[in-house]
């Protein structure tokens, strides 16, 4: 389900001369007028709609937070794509903010995955090869490494 599917301002347009099941919808980049007769463009850089819709308003463009970089700007048909800055990542269970990647693995573990905009570094036990999901290690325990380079969107 998309954000648009859940939009509170969605409604069924009034019946008109219907030549197709989907008449009364407006194309991506537009929303429907109050009377259901016209399609109104979203405002470039301000709001958008991604699908054929009967929204009374377009959806507001996301603004990238500090700590994020803008990968692509908002257009009338696509929301802004934001990505965590290098050295930070966004977890699925806390998508509202970018968190700092750990600088290294605990003693007895080796790094098998770099910091990316959507994941922390990945550590495994030297012997068993099992993943470590624990908290950031104490400074004296760490094996330092440099963060990876952001590569793709996380929003």
């Amino acid at each position: 389900i998309t954000q648009q599917d859940l939009a509170p301002q969605q409604r069924v347009a009034p019946q008109q001369k219907r030549s197709s099941p989907s008449e009364g919808l407006c194309p991506p980049g537009h929303h429907i007028s109050e009377d259901g007769r016209d399609c109104i463009s979203c405002k470039y850089g301000q709001d958008y709609s991604t699908h054929w819709n009967d929204l009374l308003f377009c959806l507001r463009c996301t603004r990238c937070d500090s700590g994020e970089v803008e990968l692509s700007p908002c257009t009338t048909t696509r929301n802004t794509v934001c990505q965590c800055e290098e050295g930070t990542f966004r977890e699925e269970d806390s998508p509202e903010m970018c968190r700092k990647c750990r600088t290294g693995c605990p003693r007895g573990m080796v790094k098998v995955g770099d910091c990316t905009p959507w994941s922390d570094i990945e550590c495994v036990h030297k012997e068993s090869g099992t993943k470590h999901s624990g908290e950031a290690p104490a400074v004296e325990e760490t094996v330092t490494s440099s963060p990876g380079t952001p590569a793709s969107p996380c929003s």
Epitope: S20, E23, L25, P27, G29, D38, S41, W52, T77
Partner: antibody, heavy 119, light 107 residues
């Protein structure tokens, strides 16, 4: 390359109907909206309506709503515009034009079809 | 419906001149304006959309500006091949409407 090829010129009597075709090629037919725009001799351009093959959405300019019917044959990537109850002021070049599913500007146009309404 | 009023309706200029065509919308259309070039006996060609974005392959002597109700198409240095009629179009609200055209000729 993208091509919109329209049917040939037509001469019709007042009160008759005309059906103009527009065959699309060089792109995925179901990904773009196709429009009809007309231009009377020496006059400006007038948008008549659209058809979107992706979901069969049709929208007409209210001015033409009672007289125009836009249909399509997806198997041949062809869109049709039928205008009924013709009058002399419908004499015009009728263009099909394409736009992406976004802002309503037209990036490719057919060559135009001259429809002459004369008794 | 939104009326698009173009001026001038006719314009004569010399090769190399800077040419400006204006378009006024009867109500606010944000930046949802496109410009087309039409040569005699041919279909229109898209030049500019979103008031100022040049379409692929359009020479950079063509530029557009404006927002709200007042829009401008500028040809920075007129070339012989620019002889044509130019139309503005609002793509803000259906029915999408066009200006009456500006016929441009070389002096």
């Amino acid at each position: 390359q993208v091509q919109l090829v329209q049917s040939g010129a037509e001469v019709k009597k007042p009160g008759a109907s005309v059906k103009v075709s527009c065959k699309a090629s060089g792109y995925t037919f179901t990904e773009y909206i196709l429009h009809w725009v007309r231009q009377a001799p020496g006059q400006g351009l007038e948008w008549m309506g659209w058809f979107y093959p992706g979901n069969n959405n049709i929208k007409y300019n209210e001015k033409f709503k009672d007289r125009v019917t836009i249909t399509a044959d997806k198997s041949t990537s062809t869109v049709y515009m039928e205008l009924s109850s013709l009058r002399s002021e419908d004499t015009a070049v009728y263009y099909c034009a394409r736009h992406e599913q976004g802002p309503g500007y037209f990036d490719y146009w057919g060559q135009g079809t001259l429809v002459t309404v004369s008794s | 419906d939104i009326q698009m009023t173009q001026s001038p309706s006719f314009l004569s200029a010399s090769v190399g001149d800077r040419v400006t065509i204006t378009c006024r919308a009867s109500q606010d259309v944000n930046t949802a304006v496109a410009w087309y070039q039409q040569k005699p006996g041919k279909a229109p060609k898209l030049l500019i959309y979103w008031a100022s974005t040049r379409h692929t392959g359009v020479p950079d002597r063509f530029s557009g500006s404006g927002s709200g109700t007042d829009f401008t198409l500028t040809i920075s240095s007129l070339q012989p091949e620019d002889v044509a009629t130019y139309y503005c179009q609002q793509h803000y609200i259906t029915p999408w409407t066009f200006g009456g055209g500006t016929k441009l000729e070389i002096k």
